[in-house]
């Protein structure tokens, strides 16, 4: 593997801008407590995804197969981008800084049309599946704003389990307590470049 590290300005302020700028008008469904999966996203954001150590998340996707890599990109190589769709959870958040008006933000992550990252809690794996809306709960992740302009993605279906990096691949990683939320292998950077 070739290691050509070059540094981009990581776009973290944009997330806060999104949180502050959005005036959210909620559907009756949210008040009634129905699943958020049928509700339109409050905003969408196209960004490249990289690890705390600036390795890129890349996708090799065919009709019937895929690979998700965590790797150093070559200097001239364009970064893969994912479409992050933001949803506000109807459940109040106890944590500060993660959402708007004390509510949690959830995201879905899509590298291309009709495909989304899914949590497979049984296999502790992160998978790419072709899905139709409404998306299953396995495609939703609670977004946490962390230190150092990083974010982390917690499974909606399995609180305390996060998307992380294991052996140069994405995997689901159990985090025991909030003290360990800053563990580097679950921290990701979002960048417009």
């Amino acid at each position: 593997m070739h290691h050509h590290h070059h540094h981009h300005h990581h776009h973290a302020a944009g997330l806060n801008d999104i949180f502050e700028a959005q005036k959210i008008e909620w559907h009756e469904a949210a008040i009634e407590g129905r699943s958020i999966t049928g509700i339109s996203p409050i905003t969408e954001y196209l960004a490249s995804l990289s690890t705390y150590n600036d390795q890129s998340i890349t996708f090799a996707l065919e009709d019937e197969s895929y690979e998700i890599y965590v790797e150093d990109l070559k200097k001239d190589e364009k970064k893969d981008k994912v479409l992050l769709s933001y949803y506000e959870s109807q459940h109040p958040s106890n944590e500060s800084g993660d959402g708007v008006d004390g509510k949690m933000l959830m995201v879905t992550l899509s590298p291309t049309k009709d495909f989304w990252l899914h949590a497979n809690n049984k296999e502790h794996s992160v998978e790419l599946h072709k899905s139709e809306k409404p998306l299953p709960d396995q495609a939703f992740f609670v977004l946490h704003n962390m230190h150092s302009n990083c974010v982390s993605f917690e499974c909606k279906t399995d609180p305390g389990v996060f998307i992380g990096v294991k052996d140069n691949h994405l995997a689901l990683i159990k985090v025991d307590s909030s003290e360990n939320l800053s563990t580097e292998n679950i921290l990701f950077k979002l960048s417009e470049t």
């Epitope: 070739h2 050509h4 090799a60 996707l61 065919e62 001239d76």
Partner: antibody, heavy 126, light 106 residues
């Protein structure tokens, strides 16, 4: 099984026009960027043009810019190359080629050619 | 656009190693692909992203890329490997091929 079948080649006079087609099957056509690559008799491969999966972005080699137009009809799973103002140096076998992987949101051209058609011969001569 | 330079021909005895180079400015900063083409046939992808083999391509094919040179290596060359080989990169959404190398198995 991925299959690409070119057609439309033939003999044409300099200054004339020709339209090549590439019928695709065995995959989700609209998900993949497609290219045309040509090979003059006894010569090497030359990339000619490419188009994104949606058809919204097109790309051309300098040697054909302004003369050739790439397009696609995703409802018919067909790729096209409209060739105008043909020159003797355009004489070649024309291959259509599919990207190895599905095009992502990032766009651009960066994947290798994973699948190739059998080619169609274009001869420009008076 | 980069000019990719390949040796016109390489000769190798059966069972021996054949190395084909592809030289271009800052080649190592890009991902190189290699294609095999036999007479009267369409090209076949044998190496992509410098080092990766598509399914169905024998392990004797390998690649590397650093500095200004990408290299395709065929270890234990067989008669069936006699063909033309082309390197290829993308540069600013333009496809660029090398001139091709004819590999002859003696």
């Amino acid at each position: 099984e991925v299959q690409l079948l070119e057609s439309g080649g033939g003999l044409v006079q300099p200054g004339g026009s020709l339209r090549l087609s590439c019928a695709a099957s065995g995959f989700t056509f609209s998900s993949y960027a497609m290219s045309w690559v040509r090979q003059a008799p006894g010569k090497g491969l030359e990339w000619v043009s490419a188009i994104s999966g949606s058809g919204g972005s097109t790309y051309y080699a300098d040697s054909v810019k302004g003369r050739f137009t790439i397009s696609r009809d995703n409802s018919k799973n067909t790729l096209y190359l409209q060739m105008n103002s043909l020159r003797a140096e355009d004489t070649a076998v024309y291959y259509c080629a599919r990207d190895l992987w599905i095009q992502l949101w990032g766009g651009g051209l960066r994947y290798p050619f994973g699948y190739w058609g059998q080619g169609t011969m274009v001869t420009v001569s008076s | 656009l980069p000019v990719l330079t390949q040796p016109p021909s390489v000769s190798v005895s059966p069972g021996q190693k054949a190395s084909i180079t592809c030289s271009g400015e800052r080649m190592g900063d890009k991902y190189a692909a290699w294609y095999q083409q036999k007479p009267g046939q369409s090209p076949i992808l044998v190496i992509y992203q410098d080092t990766k083999r598509p399914s169905g391509i024998p392990e004797r094919f390998s690649g590397s890329n650093s500095g200004n040179t990408a290299t395709l290596t065929i270890s234990g060359t067989q008669d069936m490997d006699e063909a033309d080989y082309y390197c290829q990169v993308w540069d600013s959404s333009t496809g660029v091929f090398g001139g091709g190398t004819k590999v002859t198995v003696l």
